[in-house]
Interface confidence: low
């Protein structure tokens, strides 16, 4: 019996087609993705093949002005229109709190939304009961398939799930649910979830009874053969894990941003054993037409956005590199731009001993969610900035000891190379890392722009000195694992909305051209 | 682990430079000392060496009209500006009574003020509590250093400390404090104090755990080798005392009146034992330029700034250091400002392959003729800029081979240190010089901001590549000895008036705050 699994993950509000790097579409003839194009391909496969499931592995929320304005209603509406069969909750589904998940999505979705390792407690338990499930048994042709969901246990550090949701270890939580499915004589089980490729592989290895793992969170691109676009495969598609009980378990993920549709064909024997698996992500490029009815609906929903966001704020004459491939690994000029805007927004020159009350900015690279292409006449709009800074946060002022900052910079690279969001972009700071040293001891130079000086220049960080720093509220609140900031900050003052800070700066500067100038170095 | 101790003692209100005999300066070209000159040397050493402490062994108070008028406020202000790490109380610090010490100095100093053998009693005890300390543990690089203070026990006979301060025997009082530091695992301890050379030597002999003694009060001049001025050495620098427990303890003092900066290098082993010590007082003569920002501050305190009366173009919140002492020797923020304006005035984004046609600026430091003080409400007028750029030149565009630029940068430092005008300020260039190499081979790194790129970043200069550069017409015409530019330029286009370029930029930016950010470095 053959099953076709179509899957998406980490779509991040890319309802419209995008450019190849998943930023705003500029040249339509070269654009990719978007729900209208996705629907065309899904329908084509549904017509051609008998047993098809369309699954999403989380993080539909957050990423463009669509989410800023519609706050998840757009996710429910268009996923319903595409007739998704199931979705797993991602960490970003909690970005607007539990209420921001329940009202627009959980109550409106016509498909099951799953997570086995999220347990509600307190007053939330009854309120959310039945709105998401640990698993769902779906009829597919003459057979049934069990879908069991999971969500990154790091979600409390990554989003805003509140205090009434407990995120358990994925493997610990999944096993009893899979066992339950087995007792229900469900012998074909897909784990669908959002915890990253490493955890996906562990689930494949450790959870007895899981036949296929469909993942997300790490934006992992897998491909067999010559990849069709710029993404470099992290492995073959599907990635085969040998489970502890000796089975070959296919693990898949489909990069991110709706650029690809994951396409996996699984052959089961009569006992539900996987006897073959093959496929590849399908690049949703312009050779696939956008479905006219979905496109018309998109255009209708777009009207509200256009009024909101299409005014030019200023111009860039350089590519504003906000890609995760840059900003999570090294100094990126988008990080420099944002930090420069953050400092500029905080000029308070009051005291002759100090050229300014604050000179430093830190910014988690993972908070930079999109690049901005300069080849659209250089125009920068609110919409562009909302894709870069989609989280609706604020840029806040904190006071920290030097020792806390040192810990923060150690944390920045404690697991360097895994494309994790804690890698810090900076302003008013020169940092040198030595990645050959052990985690926790990798910062070999940390110079900071003086404030108690008339000519700003860089001096070594002093462990016992108290410094003011501008940073995203997300970091002030300990996000991306920066617990030391939350625990050790001496003062915290809320600031202005992140997009507004950057848009004001760009409007003021008129033309911008930030460079990669050596703020962050590796020795 | 190596520690550099910079030290002064018995400065006695010599904030301005003095004649060779420490009286009022008459012929400026032969004058010495003063806080502006001291700051230049201190900063030079801080930049060059990793672990530096700047210490004062007392008697800053008393000696010139500065103390008569400002009553110690000048000491706090300028010692803060110089970023002293610690000071010991001298007898003269009590000349205006305890109140005359507490209000202007103890409450305003941003560095610890120390004395272990002064004990407060009665109502004074709570009032003065925490304002001076017996010792302070200072972080220096990755290590900590304990500084324990002492003051001449003769102070009640020499000054006006009142009845609520008890001056104990130095050795008796120091030992328990040193013992306390040892229990805190502080294994590198400096005794810093003001009791005279004989007591300094006794402390070195008798106080177990003291590694170095930095003294004052007796105006002792120590020197190894041929002394550089009129003072006759009382012994070698450092003076080595063998302690009762068999250790070699270096003892130093730096004459008086700010004429010398004591310079002592100590090498400690892992257990905090002194394994070597060497150095000499540095004569602060006119070969060392006075730091312009400190000098400007001195002049302000001395005569009050004139009000400017012309139109405001924009504001600066930093000191725009256009002094020859800076701009002819190192990166100066006035040079950075002007170069940034020159690039901004030449934004011509025409080709998708190039973010801009030009990214580089060079500017002879000798062409910057004045600083601009930010302490006039930050106001910048055309008149100010005309003082900076008085020659009515233009900022031009040239095309040069990389090899020509390399020659230009070699010329920039071919006779470095003579305050000659050819020292280049830059924009879009990162240069590293090694002045220990022979002239013509001093440029060890020359990275330039790419133009044929979508994200500007720094790449090594290529000898055979052709680059566009913005520079003053003076340089394009071979001025300041830049014959190679005149001889080898491939194209030269006249540009806009120099003052106008800068004034337009300042008007556009509204508020400026250029920094010294590492464009020019010395290895």
């Amino acid at each position: 019996w053959e099953l076709t699994i179509l899957h998406t993950n980490d779509v991040h509000s890319r309802l419209e087609q995008t450019s190849e790097d998943s930023s705003k579409c500029v040249n339509a003839s070269r654009c990719m993705g978007g729900v209208a194009r996705l629907f065309t391909k899904v329908q084509q496969i549904r017509r051609a093949e008998p047993n098809v499931l369309l699954l999403d592995a989380g993080d539909q929320y957050q990423g463009t002005i669509w989410f800023t304005v519609y706050k998840g209603a757009e996710v429910a509406h268009f996923m319903n229109a595409l007739r998704y069969d199931a979705m797993a909750l991602g960490n970003h589904e909690f970005d607007n709190g539990v209420e921001g998940l329940i009202e627009p999505l959980l109550k409106e979705a016509k498909f099951p939304i799953l997570s086995a390792n999220i347990k509600a407690k307190g007053p939330l338990a009854s309120q959310i009961s039945g709105l998401y499930l640990p698993y769902k048994v779906l009829p597919v042709g003459d057979e049934v398939v069990g879908i069991v969901g999971y969500t990154s246990k790091e979600t409390p550090f990554l989003s805003n799930p509140g205090t009434n949701l407990v995120f358990e270890d994925e493997i610990t939580a999944l096993q009893p649910e899979v066992d339950k499915l087995k007792t229900l004589n469900v012998n074909k089980i897909i784990a669908l979830g959002h915890s990253g490729f490493e955890t996906d592989k562990l689930i494949a290895q450790k959870v007895r009874g899981v036949d296929v793992v469909v993942g997300g969170h790490s934006n992992t691109f897998l491909y067999t053969g010559n990849p069709p676009s710029k993404e470099v495969p992290a492995g073959k598609y599907p990635f085969i894990v040998t489970s502890d009980d000796g089975r070959k378990v296919p693990v898949v993920q489909a990069y991110a941003f709706g650029k690809y549709l994951g396409y996996l064909k699984i052959e089961f024997d009569e006992r539900g054993n996987v006897i073959s698996s093959h496929g590849n992500p399908i690049l949703l490029n312009s050779s696939i037409p956008e479905d006219p009815s979905i496109k018309a609906d998109i255009n209708k929903w777009r009207i509200k956005l256009d009024n909101y966001s299409t005014q030019e704020l200023g111009k860039t004459i350089v590519y504003l590199d906000g890609s995760s491939q840059s900003c999570r690994f090294r100094e990126c000029n988008m990080g420099n731009l944002i930090c420069d805007a953050m400092i500029n927004n905080n000029l308070r020159h009051a005291d002759e001993m100090f050229w300014n009350h604050v000179s430093m900015c830190i910014l988690n690279g993972g908070g930079i969610r999109s690049p901005i292409d300069e080849r659209n006449n250089g125009t920068i709009t609110w919409e562009n900035l909302a894709a870069v800074l989609p989280f609706g946060g604020t840029f806040d002022l904190v006071q920290l000891k030097g020792s806390t900052l040192k810990k923060a910079f150690e944390h920045s690279v404690h697991r360097y190379g895994q494309s994790t969001g804690e890698f810090l972009q900076v302003g008013g700071i020169h940092v040198v890392y030595d990645l050959s040293r052990k985690p926790g001891d990798r910062v070999v130079k940390l110079d900071v722009l003086c404030t108690k000086c008339r000519v700003p220049s860089y001096d070594p960080l002093k462990m016992d000195e108290i410094y003011k720093v501008i940073l995203p509220n997300f970091l002030a609140n300990g996000g991306d694992g920066f617990q030391m900031i939350k625990d050790e900050l001496l003062r915290h003052d809320s600031g202005d909305q992140d997009i507004n800070v950057v848009s004001t700066y760009i409007s003021k500067m008129k033309v911008i051209y930030p460079a990669v100038e050596g703020r962050i170095k590796f020795s | 682990w190596e520690l550099t101790i910079l030290h002064t003692n018995d400065v006695h209100s010599r904030l301005e430079q003095t004649s060779e005999d420490s009286s009022k300066c008459v012929n400026a070209s032969r004058c010495m000392g003063g806080v502006a000159r001291l700051f230049t040397k201190v900063q030079q050493i801080r930049r060059a060496e990793p672990n530096v402490l700047l210490l004062d062994a007392g008697d800053q108070y008393q000696g010139t009209i500065w103390f008569t008028v400002y009553k110690g406020a000048e000491v706090a202000h300028f010692m803060n500006a110089l970023r002293y790490d610690a000071m010991a109380l001298g007898n003269h610090e009590f000349d205006n009574g305890v109140e005359g010490l507490i209000e202007p100095l103890l409450k305003e100093a941003k560095f610890p003020i120390l004395s272990a053998n002064i004990k407060a009693k009665g109502p004074l005890a709570s009032q003065i509590s925490g304002l001076y300390l017996p010792y302070k543990v200072l972080p220096v690089g990755d290590e900590v250093v304990g500084i324990v203070g002492y003051t001449s026990k003769e102070t009640p006979f020499l000054s006006n400390p009142g009845t609520n301060l008890v001056f104990e025997d130095e050795i008796t009082a120091l030992q328990p404090e040193v013992d306390k530091l040892k229990t805190l695992n502080v294994n590198k301890i400096i005794a810093l104090g003001h009791s005279g050379f004989e007591t300094d030597k006794l402390i070195a002999q008798k106080v177990r755990g003291v590694d170095v003694v930095v003294g004052g009060h007796s105006n002792t001049f120590l020197y190894t080798g041929n002394p550089p001025s009129k003072e006759v050495p009382a012994g070698k620098y450092p003076f080595i005392v063998t302690s009762d427990d068999g250790r070699k303890v270096p003892v130093v003092q730096a004459y008086a009146f700010g004429k010398y900066l004591g310079y002592l290098k100590i090498e400690f082993d892992e257990r905090g034992n002194v394994i070597s010590s060497h150095g000499n007082p540095i004569l602060l003569n006119s070969s060392i330029p006075e730091d312009p920002s400190i000098k400007a501050d001195i002049n302000k305190w001395r005569i009050k700034l004139d009000n400017y009366s012309t139109q405001e173009l924009g504001k600066t919140i930093v000191y725009l250091d256009g002094s020859s002492q800076s701009c002819r020797f190192r990166e100066c923020n006035m040079g950075n400002l002007i170069c940034d304006a020159m690039i901004n005035n030449n934004l011509r984004h025409a080709d998708e392959m190039f973010w801009n046609h030009v990214s580089m600026c060079i500017l002879n430091g000798g062409g910057i003729r004045s600083p601009i003080d930010e302490r006039n409400n930050g106001t910048i007028t055309w008149e100010n800029l005309a003082a900076v750029l008085p020659f009515g030149g233009t900022f031009d565009l040239v095309q040069l081979k990389g090899s020509t630029l390399k020659k230009a940068f070699e010329h920039s430092v071919h006779r470095y240190g003579q305050s000659t005008g050819e020292f280049l300020q830059v924009g879009g260039i990162h240069v590293v010089y090694d002045l220990s190499r022979k002239p013509g081979d001093r440029v060890v790194k020359l990275d330039v901001l790419c133009t044929k790129c979508r994200v500007p970043s720094y790449d090594p200069l290529k000898m055979d590549e052709i680059y566009k550069v913005i520079l003053p017409n003076f340089l394009a015409n071979g001025g300041d000895g830049f014959q190679m530019i005149k001889d080898e330029l491939l194209r030269h286009d006249s540009g806009d008036q120099d003052i106008n370029v800068v004034s337009t930029y300042i008007s556009k930016m509204k508020v400026i705050y250029p920094a010294v950010e590492g464009r020019i470095k010395f290895s």
């Epitope: 690994f329 360097y416 052990k438 590796f522 | -």
Partner: antibody, heavy 120, light 106 residues
């Protein structure tokens, strides 16, 4: 999958120089340092140094400073090691190696090795 | 440079034996030690890093331990395919390897 494909064996005369190549595939070349390791016949391993393909920055074992020069060509995802003034002491198998994660060490991925023989 | 003194140079083993190799660092290297296996004509293979963490896919008969200056590598039950040279390596200060231990059949 991740592969490091090195150039073939070299027979060179004393005093000459040689350039060994290492073609990387299956991962983001610029994101990981490329290390080089020497193994003389029947001997242990000696770390030569590494180069960061992203910016061309390199770090050398002092023993090999002046002997080895490391370069990269990002466009072809290839790393190179140039060895100069060769003597019989330089006869060895030379490996390129990539770290597990972006560490300098913990070499999880190795080239197949290039035998360099220095002989008159 | 940190010197890694590896002992013994040779080990004669039979299938099923338990084997222990030691490496002593000339100064503390924390836990920044890796172990490699090299078979004739092949490139080395990473087995253990951070002194005790098994690299992906390495059988659990291979274990490592130690901290500071003394490190141990153990094969709990030697199999025929384990005959090879084993190297330790430190990455705490620059990067150096041990001289190697050759496992040979008795």
């Amino acid at each position: 999958q991740i592969q490091l494909q090195q150039s073939g064996p070299e027979l060179v005369k004393p005093g000459a120089s040689v350039k060994v190549s290492c073609k990387a595939s299956g991962y983001a070349f610029a994101s990981y340092n490329m290390n080089w390791v020497k193994q003389s016949h029947g001997k242990s391993l000696d770390w030569i140094g590494y180069i960061d393909p992203y910016n061309g920055g390199s770090s050398y074992n002092l023993t090999f400073k002046g002997k080895a020069t490391l370069t990269v060509d990002k466009s072809s995802t290839t790393a190179y090691m140039h060895l100069n003034s060769l003597t019989s002491e330089d006869s060895a198998v030379y490996y390129c190696a990539r770290g597990y994660g972006n560490y300098k060490a913990w070499f999880a991925y190795w080239g197949q090795g290039t035998l360099v023989t220095v002989s008159a | 440079d940190v010197v890694m003194t590896q002992t013994p140079k040779f080990l004669l083993v039979s299938a099923g034996d338990r084997v222990t190799i030691t490496c002593k660092a000339s100064q503390s290297v924390s836990n920044d030690v890796a172990w490699y296996q090299q078979k004739p004509g092949q490139s080395p293979k990473l087995l253990i890093y951070y002194a005790s963490t098994r690299y992906t896919g390495v059988p659990d008969r291979f274990t490592g331990s130690g901290y500071g200056t003394d490190f141990t590598f153990t094969i709990s039950t030697v199999q025929a395919e384990d005959l090879a040279v084993y190297f330790c390596q430190q990455d705490y200060s620059s990067l150096t390897f041990g001289a190697g231990t050759k496992l040979e059949l008795k």
